[in-house]
């Protein structure tokens, strides 16, 4: 049994007007925008900010006054600021939801060093690998290099989330006092779920500077 408790001053059971409620979603799976109402005869409109309206078609998008909007097969189109709107006694009420998608997309991977790298023996090698991903993506970054078995390298990682459109992951490989055995191919591998990208560079060691 489901009981509605009618409240003309509060059409939605949960109101999120100050800060949107975050809903985690997976593309291809069911997504519920839980703007259930206090009375079954309240008409609710689902909007995606700023201009889109999501129309219930009885199939992919269904309105259920006890649950909210049920989207059977969520797509990228449902990612964003979704607002349930209801007008009661001439007053517009809104409750807001922010759909969050965990992605496995890797936009770009780069080693920010000239290729090939030319270095004097005894000097320090620093390679900076940068992976750019959409928001809500996490990655694993690993290095392979010639003297890996002796764990010659130290690796530092950091994330830059100041960009409003993308995450930028950094992995900085450092090897002190480079030797001849350190010459060869250095590969940065980036993995996010099933997605994988890699980039490599060749490192050459020279005994002394020459023109």
């Amino acid at each position: 049994i489901y009981i509605f408790i009618s409240d003309t001053g509060r059409p939605f059971v949960e109101m999120y007007s100050e800060i949107p409620e975050i809903i985690h979603m997976t593309e291809g799976r069911e997504l519920v925008i839980p703007c259930r109402v206090t009375s079954p005869n309240i008409t609710v409109t689902l909007k995606k900010f700023p201009l889109d309206t999501l129309i219930p078609d009885g199939k992919r998008i269904i309105w259920d006054s006890r649950k909210g909007f049920i989207i059977s097969n969520a797509t990228y189109k449902e990612i964003g600021l979704l607002t349930c709107e209801a007008t009661v006694n001439g007053h517009l009420y809104k409750t807001n939801y922010l759909t969050h998608r965990q992605t496995n997309t890797i936009i770009d991977v780069q080693i920010s060093t000239p290729r090939p790298v030319k270095l004097l023996r005894g000097h320090t090698l620093v390679l900076n690998c940068t992976a750019t991903t959409p928001l809500n993506t996490r990655v694993q970054m690993t290095w392979s290099y010639p003297d890996e078995k002796n764990k010659r390298a130290s690796v530092r990682r950091r994330i830059d989330q100041s960009n409003s459109h993308a995450n930028i992951f950094y992995s900085v490989l450092t090897i002190d006092k480079m030797q001849n055995k350190d010459k060869g191919l250095y590969t940065c591998r980036v993995r996010s779920g099933p997605s994988f990208k890699s980039v490599n560079t060749s490192v050459h060691i020279y005994d002394k500077a020459f023109i």
């Epitope: 800060i19 949107p20 700023p50 990612i79 928001l135 409003s164 459109h165 993308a166």
Partner: antibody, heavy 119, light 110 residues
Framework: EVQLLESGGGLVQPGGSLRLSCEAS????????MNWVRQAPGKGLEWVAT????????SHAPAVKGRFTISRDNSKNTAYVQMNSLRAEDSAVYYC????????????WGRGTTVTVSS | QSVLTQPPSASGTPGQRVTISCSGS????????VYWYQQLPGTAPKLLIY???QRPSGVPDRFSGSKSGTSASLAISGLQSEDEADYYC???????????FGGGTKLTVL
């Protein structure tokens, strides 16, 4: 790096036309709504138009409705505003901005392109 | 005439706290999120506050926003000389079906 770059501004006579372009880079352009905002010399910000991510829905300010048309080409990562029947009061710096999935405000702006309408 | 109303100017000395108000109506501020933008001389605007009170990454916590009914305000504490700029409030307007801005407030650090 996330960037919006406007182009197409210039000097045009009253009644003339211009098409401004806004090229995006460094983000998934096709996911976000785009806006044009203008600023007359010494004045405040004025919204011009907004287009949804797919390019299927647009909205224009009353001051430009029927004269300006916002559009986008997601394959080129570019938004446009076609400006017809230009008037002296349309003279301004025109900025494009994106409304993204993080803040849903205008969180990335271009540097702007200047439009001068004068005879 | 701007849809949202802001004081044209505000001022303060370094270290002081300054508040800028923004007044609107039920079709804009009351039912939508308020955003604040900072525009330094000769540059494009920059988003300072979103969702009424949230700061994007990189914006100092000296900047704070709030909203009540049809009004919003931006507070800047510990005023610094680099805060001298124009500040605009903005929000979506349901009647207009578009963005609206305040006329801007020129902040002077004395």
């Amino acid at each position: 790096e996330v960037q919006l770059l406007e182009s197409g501004g210039g000097l045009v006579q009253p009644g003339g036309s211009l098409r401004l372009s806004c090229e995006a880079s460094g983000f998934d352009f096709s996911t976000y709504a785009m806006n044009w905002v203008r600023q007359a010399p010494g004045k405040g910000l004025e919204w011009v138009a907004t287009i949804n991510s797919e390019g299927t829905i647009t909205s224009h300010a009353p001051a430009v409705k029927g004269r300006f048309t916002i559009s986008r080409d997601n394959s080129k990562n570019t938004a446009y505003v076609q400006m017809n029947s230009l008037r002296a009061e349309d003279s301004a710096v025109y900025y494009c901005s994106s409304t993204t999935g993080t803040t849903h405000g205008m969180d990335v702006w271009g540097r702007g392109t200047t439009v001068t309408v004068s005879s | 005439q701007s849809v949202l109303t802001q004081p044209p100017s505000a001022s303060g000395t370094p270290g002081q706290r300054v508040t800028i108000s923004c007044s609107g109506s039920s079709s804009n501020i009351q039912n939508n999120y308020v955003y604040w933008y900072q525009q330094l001389p000769g540059t494009a605007p920059k988003l300072l506050i979103y969702f009424n009170s949230q700061r994007p990454s990189g914006v100092p916590d000296r900047f704070s926003g709030s909203k009540s009914g049809t009004s919003a305000s931006l507070a800047i504490s510990g005023l610094q000389s680099e805060d001298e700029a124009d500040y605009y409030c903005g929000t979506w307007d349901d009647s207009l079906n578009g963005w609206v801005f305040g006329g801007g407030t020129k902040l002077t650090v004395l």
